[in-house]
Interface confidence: low
């Protein structure tokens, strides 16, 4: 038995930030779960993790350098990514694992969301310009 995940097919990050909502066919209330967001067709980069446990506050972290936050709904987790770079335009997949109560459950691989980062290029501040061009 697998959890189904719905994601927007595409999102555009205009200001180097985006909200990606992962909607699950499963109610996360009073569950111990680990929701994660993965970058790339092979899901090789774990962008952000939201760990939930009914007895603890939500834990949100990235071990791969992304600036992320997470919000929990009954059947969804929303990842808020900031300071994205144009070259981080890619496909992003939601993953969910429920550890408690048994049985362990995870999701069918979703179709993913293409995040197109169109924002400012996070250039140096004009007060500190880079080397001048000839």
């Amino acid at each position: 038995n697998k959890i189904l995940v719905k994601q927007s097919p595409m999102l555009v990050a205009y200001d180097n930030a985006v909200n990606l909502s992962c909607k699950y066919s499963y109610n996360l209330f009073s569950r111990e779960f680990r929701a994660s967001l993965h970058k790339g067709l092979d899901s090789a980069v774990e962008v952000c993790v939201v760990y939930g446990n009914y007895s603890q506050q939500l834990q949100v972290y990235s071990k791969t350098g992304f600036n992320c936050d997470g919000k929990l709904g009954n059947e969804s987790v929303t990842f808020y990514l900031q300071n994205l770079y144009v070259n981080q335009t890619d496909i992003y997949f939601c993953k969910i694992e429920v550890m408690y109560p048994p049985p362990y459950l995870d999701n069918e691989k979703s179709n993913g969301t293409i995040i197109h980062v169109k924002g400012k290029h996070l250039c140096p501040s004009p007060l500190f310009p880079g080397p001048s061009k000839p």
């Epitope: 111990e32 680990r34 993790v49 760990y51 446990n53 007895s55 603890q56 506050q57 939500l58 834990q59 949100v60 972290y61 990235s62 071990k63 550890m99």
Partner: antibody, heavy 127, light 104 residues
Framework: EVQLVESGGGLVKPGGSLRLSCGGS????????MNWVRQAPGKGLEWVGR??????????DYAAPVKGRFTISRDYSKNTLYLQMNSLKTEDTGVYYC??????????????????WGQGTTVTVSS | EIVLTQSPATLSLSPGERATLSCRAS??????LAWYQQKPGQAPRLLIY???NRATGIPARFSGSGSGTDFTLTISSLEPEDFAVYYC??????FGPGTKVDIK
């Protein structure tokens, strides 16, 4: 991004005291189970002790060689972990690392290795 | 107290070769065993947790196996950056003495 940064190392005489600090950022520090691990020069890794997360009672456990001499504590408001080292011996010399398991899962029953480490701070006990 | 023993103490191999490192526990630790890599002057890095699961960002050439008292870390084809010291660790946090993998 998840980060741990240790400070407070230095040179101390046998019998002296030293307090190490470890600042945590990028994760919910209060709930994390935090550890100290040390490494004597040219030797292997040795676990020193750990302190549980706030929601798990915040109690500490220690390795036999340091029990009664070292105390682990934390300041929740400052996201900081401490290692108070008293009655120091020459064999306490080494690099001290602050580590946590931002576990794949949380809690002792879901231990999954220490996947976040600080850069280490050096303690030298010598007369 | 559970004691971990690692063998061999040193493993001399060439890039491209397969490395097999062993860790034995004095009593069962179920699958609660982790493997770390440490390079000179650096903090250890978690490679494998729960005996066989690769940690985030660890290349597929690293694999772990075993349960109970006998565990193995395998590096399928050594890359130049894999020459380092490898430690195993069990849930009550004690570490093995380490295996140094150096260039033949």
């Amino acid at each position: 991004e998840v980060q741990l940064v240790e400070s407070g190392g230095g040179l101390v005489k046998p019998g002296g005291s030293l307090r190490l600090s470890c600042g945590g950022s990028g994760f919910t520090f209060n709930n994390a189970w935090m550890n100290w691990v040390r490494q004597a020069p040219g030797k292997g890794l040795e676990w020193v002790g750990r302190i549980k997360g706030k929601t798990d009672g915040g109690t500490a456990d220690y390795a036999a060689p340091v029990k009664g001499r070292f105390t682990i504590s934390r300041d929740y408001s400052k996201n900081t972990l401490y290692l108070q080292m008293n009655s120091l011996k020459t064999e306490d010399t080494g690099v001290y690392y602050c580590t946590t398991y931002l576990p794949y899962y949380y809690g002792s029953e879901r231990w999954s290795g220490m996947d976040v480490w600080g850069q280490g701070t050096t303690v030298t006990v010598s007369s | 107290e559970i004691v971990l023993t690692q063998s061999p103490a040193t493993l001399s191999l060439s890039p491209g070769e397969r490395a097999t490192l062993s860790c034995r526990a004095s009593q069962s630790v179920s699958s609660y065993l982790a493997w770390y890599q440490q390079k000179p002057g650096q903090a250890p890095r978690l490679l494998i947790y729960d005996a066989s699961n690769r940690a985030t960002g660890i290349p597929a050439r690293f694999s772990g196996s075993g349960s109970g008292t006998d565990f193995t870390l395998t590096i399928s084809s050594l890359e130049p950056e894999d020459f380092a010291v490898y430690y195993c660790q069990q849930r009550s946090n004690t570490f093995g003495p380490g295996t140094k993998v150096d260039i033949k």
